[in-house]
């Protein structure tokens, strides 16, 4: 049966009708509307935008649209006491100061409430000392410094370039190395693509441009003062000393003009190799401290930001399902921005707006989806995924029983080269089938499918003729749904050519120059890539909410489980002596994966054959599919990360943005050769193999015949 028959609607109200209703011109109009003033979390402007979106979603035809508010810990610069960094001479005089703001882009000179660049949640402080250049401040960069170069960062101010990993991991690494302050800067090697002009003449970062961002290490906790529970009116709040994930040393971001002034004087050790050199005309010496002529000069940080409990607002829209109203498909993306949010988040919010409008149009014509669709405009994503996490904490019992899928909708573009998808393996076939039905917007692929252009430009490293689909990591609002609650999740956006553009993210990320004009002039003048992303995100939501049998293929999970087991096994076997000494066996894990593969195969056969006209059997099979992702959740969570509970995937402990497979085993093996007590360390590896094997076996059994 078609999904139309399931909801007794006329055949014209199918996926095609929904997709045909999506218009590039509307997305363009919505983006313009959302980007004219800043919408920083916790501000009046962002509250007003929440109310506007609520009103418009109601007009579009949703059944209900409510604001859900929480009082969470946010962070702001002190308006009268600005943050900056100085070079001071031996007398303590400031002989150089970094800029206090970014020069505003043309047309925005008179806009008020542009928050100056700052590292959200930095503690206050005025540390001074010698500088050490720590490259990207990754785990391996500190290993190189401390173990190979014997450079001690204790009591030093470190300067790190943005890129490669989440900034919060950089700060955590610097803290562990004993640093007393961190300066983050954007190097042109990472944020200035060759042959492209700086904004406003191109999409590159000017020397005065600075990346804002939070520097928390929340590990999925949400509001730092109410981990595990919603920050509601009767919440019990921790004291600031017990808050989750706050940095303990001052941190501040700068642009490459200011970085040049700090780095050009660096002395001490030469960079260990070319991978430590950026594109500035400086030696990239590691330090510590400045060269001979300047050796008496020091660096001083002046940080006066404050942490404040502030009200935030999510917008939650509901389109009730006609047949299974107690099954929820969620489309969510954030609304808060650092400044104008031209790309992050409003290129995503504009797409969500148009998707809501299209669904609303169908609903006004008498159509309803089979399952309930929830639409969310999250607040305070930039401050640690706070809005989505608090809402999920408040509604966790409903979500764990009723949540079918979550589709994320942050930035629709980070380039205009090809599609990028990260999702649960359960959604691979859905994404493949959908993209085969959509037209490619790419030049040279006229009349070809999106699947074809995507596969050509971004081929899978494992399977020929298929596109690359990546693991979910974190750093966005799907985190609580996937990593904590085990709800099947996915995200899609248009991206750059990673082979030719090795800079991190897009150059103007989180700067004042992320404007409507950036998108309209340089990234997507016809808004055709935005439209394609709307079709992918909207199409996924439509299918998930409307297909009679959920469009999940459990066999694809079996394939990746074997791949991940092979990978973690090979990492472990790099230590053959210890493997032998401690009798480390992977038999249980491979056996569980084998069982999962066989049971998934049998389940898929039953799925083809069962009587879809029997609503009880249909619901039973769909529930087995819905709850499969849930079965990978360990209620105890990962070691020291209780809110990361998915046993197959977690954000990397070294880079929140990246996903790691079998993270419990991976972390137990990481740097194991340096552990003081090898017997204990290998015991933990064995325990993690046991947890993983048990979880895979338990998940397999949820797919077995029920009786």
């Amino acid at each position: 049966k078609s999904s139309n028959e399931a909801t007794n609607i006329t055949p014209k109200h199918n996926m095609k009708a929904f997709l045909d209703e999506l218009k590039a011109e509307n997305i363009k109009k919505f983006l313009y509307n959302f980007t004219q003033i800043p919408h920083l979390a916790g501000t009046e402007q962002n509250f007003q935008l929440a109310k506007q979106i609520q009103s418009q979603w109601k007009e579009f035809g949703l059944d209900s649209v409510e604001l859900a508010h929480y009082d969470v810990l946010l962070s702001y610069p002190n308006k009268t006491h600005p943050n900056y960094i100085s070079i001071i001479n031996e007398d303590g005089n400031e002989i150089f100061n970094t800029s206090l703001f970014e020069p505003p882009p043309p047309g925005y000179e008179n806009v008020s409430d542009i928050v100056p660049p700052f590292s959200a949640f930095s503690p206050q402080g005025m540390p001074e000392g010698d500088l050490v250049y720590v490259n990207y401040a990754r785990t391996e960069d500190f290993f190189k410094l401390e173990r190979d170069m014997k450079i001690n960062c204790s009591g030093k101010i470190v300067i790190a370039r943005y890129g490669k990993v989440f900034r919060g991991n950089k700060v955590k690494n610097a803290q562990l190395a004993g640093a007393k302050g961190v300066i983050l800067y954007s190097d042109p090697a990472d944020y200035f693509a060759p042959g492209v002009k700086s904004y406003p003449d191109g999409w590159n970062l000017p020397g005065g441009g600075v990346q804002r961002g939070n520097i928390l290490n929340l590990n999925g906790a949400g509001d730092p003062l109410t981990p595990g529970y919603p920050a509601n009116e009767y919440a019990y709040r921790r004291g600031i000393a017990e808050a989750v994930g706050l940095p303990s040393i001052p941190v501040h971001p700068i642009g490459y003009y200011d970085a040049q002034k700090l780095l050009e004087k660096m002395g001490g050790s030469a960079p260990p190799d070319s991978s430590w050199r950026g594109s500035l005309k400086v030696p990239y010496n590691v330090g510590p401290g400045f060269t001979g002529n300047f050796s008496t000069q020091k660096v001083k940080m002046h940080i006066h930001s404050t942490n404040e409990v502030t009200r935030i607002y999510n917008v939650i829209g509901t389109l009730r399902g006609a047949v299974e109203p107690d099954r929820y498909v969620i489309l969510g993306g954030h609304r808060d921005s650092w400044v104008f949010g031209g790309i992050d988040p409003q290129s995503g919010a504009a797409v969500v707006h148009e998707i809501v409008r299209s669904f609303g149009t169908l609903k006004k014509e008498g159509w309803r989806p089979r399952r309930t669709i929830l639409f969310a405009s999250w607040d305070a994503e930039e401050f640690g995924l706070l809005g989505s996490t608090e809402w999920a904490e408040e509604n966790s019992r409903l979500l764990q029983e009723r949540g079918v899928a979550y589709i994320n909708a942050d930035s629709s573009i980070e380039g205009n080269y090809t599609l990028r998808v990260d999702c649960t393996p359960l959604m691979y076939s859905l994404v493949h089938n959908l993209t085969k039905e959509l037209k490619s917007p790419d030049e040279g692929f006229e009349g070809k499918s999106l699947y074809e252009s995507w596969t050509k430009k971004s081929p899978s490293p494992e399977f020929s003729g298929m596109p690359r689909i990546s693991k979910l990591g974190s750093g966005n609002d799907f985190e609580v749904f996937f990593q904590r609650l085990g709800i099947a999740s996915g995200r899609a956006r248009y991206t750059k050519n990673w082979e030719t553009n090795k800079f991190s993210g897009y150059p103007l990320y989180h700067s004042v120059y992320e404007t409507y004009e950036l998108v309209e002039k340089f990234y997507d003048p016809m808004f055709k890539y935005h439209l394609t992303v709307a079709q992918v995100r909207g199409g996924m939501v439509f299918e998930l909410a409307n297909s009679i049998v959920l469009p999940f293929d459990c066999r694809d999970y079996a394939v990746v489980l074997r791949k991940y087991a092979d990978k973690i096994y090979s990492i472990s076997m790099k230590h053959p002596q210890e493997m032998k000494t401690y009798s480390v066996s992977f038999d249980s894990l491979f056996s569980a994966v084998k069982n999962f593969t066989e049971i998934a195969s049998k389940f898929s056969e039953r799925l083809q054959d069962f009587d879809k006209s029997n609503p009880i059997v249909l619901r039973m099979m769909n529930d087995q599919l819905m709850f499969l992702e849930r079965a990978f959740i360990d209620p105890l969570g990962l070691p020291d990360r209780p809110f990361y509970r998915h046993v197959i995937y977690a954000p990397s402990s070294h880079n929140k943005y990246a996903g790691e497979s079998f993270p419990g085993i991976y972390d137990a093996l990481f740097d194991i050769e340096s552990k003081v007590d090898p017997s204990k360390a290998w015991g933990e590896v064995k325990r993690q193999i046991y947890v993983a094997a048990f979880t895979v076996q338990a998940a397999a059994e949820t797919l077995s015949e029920v009786a």
């Epitope: 092979d566 990978k567 992977f586």
Partner: nanobody, 111 residues
Framework: EVQLVESGGGLVQPGGSLRLSCAAS????????MSWVRQAPGKGLEWVSS??????YYADSVKGRFTISRDNSKSTLYLQMNSLRAEDTAVYYC??????WGQGTLVTVSS
């Protein structure tokens, strides 16, 4: 009971080639990743290569010279060793993990 039996070792000149085999029994061979590990005279165990279900992994010291493969229908693991060097001299073990190992086969690279 798991059994792993290596063969194919011997004396070979530098620059020469050898192909090691490992016959496996007592378990469903195709469902498990397998490895080659070696021990040079007077040295500790060194991981050489692993193979899963189509995925292969190599130590930097052998990358581009050695190729691991498997024939699931024969329950056999292979290691094709080309451009052999004196430092490749070692006893080569077939290993299922830390518990199940073969008895090893000696490879000597010498002129």
């Amino acid at each position: 009971e798991v059994q792993l039996v290596e063969s194919g070792g011997g004396l070979v000149q530098p620059g020469g080639s050898l192909r090691l085999s490992c016959a496996a029994s007592g378990f469903t061979f195709s469902s498990y990743a397998m490895s080659w590990v070696r021990q040079a005279p007077g040295k500790g165990l060194e991981w050489v290569s692993s193979i899963g279900d189509g995925t292969t992994y190599y130590a930097d010291s052998v990358k581009g010279r050695f190729t691991i493969s498997r024939d699931n229908s024969k329950s056999t693991l292979y290691l094709q060793m080309n451009s052999l060097r004196a430092e490749d001299t070692a006893v080569y073990y077939c290993a299922k993990d830390g518990v199940h190992w073969g008895q090893g086969t000696l490879v000597t690279v010498s002129s």
